[in-house]
């Protein structure tokens, strides 16, 4: 359903551990919205 990808994971971090903390669609949006901006992803200026 969602097409979000990361280039790398932090220490001791797994994709499963990230997803387990995102309990709702809004959490998912908030998490990746900031990631896109801070990492220059999406359509960063």
């Amino acid at each position: 359903k969602h097409k979000c990808f990361r280039n790398s994971l932090e220490n001791n971090e797994t994709l499963e551990s990230i997803m387990n903390t995102l309990e709702s669609e809004e959490d998912f949006r908030k998490y990746f919205y900031y990631l896109e901006g801070s990492k220059g992803g999406g359509g960063s200026k």
Partner: antibody, heavy 122, light 113 residues
Amino acid sequence: QVQLVQSGGGLVQPGGSLRLSCAASGFTFSNYAMSWVRQAPGKGLEWVSAISGSGDNTYYADSVRGRFTISRDNSKNTLYLQMNSLRAEDTAIYYCAKDPHSSRWPGFFDLWGRGTLVTVSS
Amino acid sequence: DIQMTQSPDSLAVSLGERATINCKSSQSVLYSSNNQNYLAWYQQKPGQPPKLLIYWASTRESGVPDRFSGSGSGTDFTLTISSLQAEDVAVYYCQQYYSTPYTFGQGTKVEIK
């Protein structure tokens, strides 16, 4: 230059329909989520609707859900708002606005159109 | 929905003096997973669309004068104009983008005393 040019406002009777357009230039349109925000005369700002860069995901305020439809044509770099069953309380300046860094979701807005006035009155 | 409440509704400040606008959200807009506040500030002059000033509560948009600053966290936020200039006369709005529907404060009108 980077800009959003709006068209399509005007006077419409209650219950009528209107389609607003927002033509984008100066940036890769499909890379950004877009929104419509309105402002009733002399009042504050109200977020109305948003759409992802691909057009796959849409979002609406409760006040317009089921009456308004947001869409985009990335081949034409144009955003649309189809407004049906219009009410007097929909009278406002409608702005299109661009998200600064996300194609998937709207958030805040770094580029705005000049606005187009929609008046719903008999 | 998250309600945004600004205070005061209007304020008059002398040129060169400090202007402070407050914004309070009905629930926290701080996301614990990244410790970021999902809050933006805009300036709107008569007959013009809004202009983005601040996002993530305290990050100044490119090209915005450094006399504009944002602070706060959780539910309480402040926009400060450190030395008011004539061109700063406008209405200022806060906006939360923590959850949909995104909501704005009612606006604060800043005038010259």
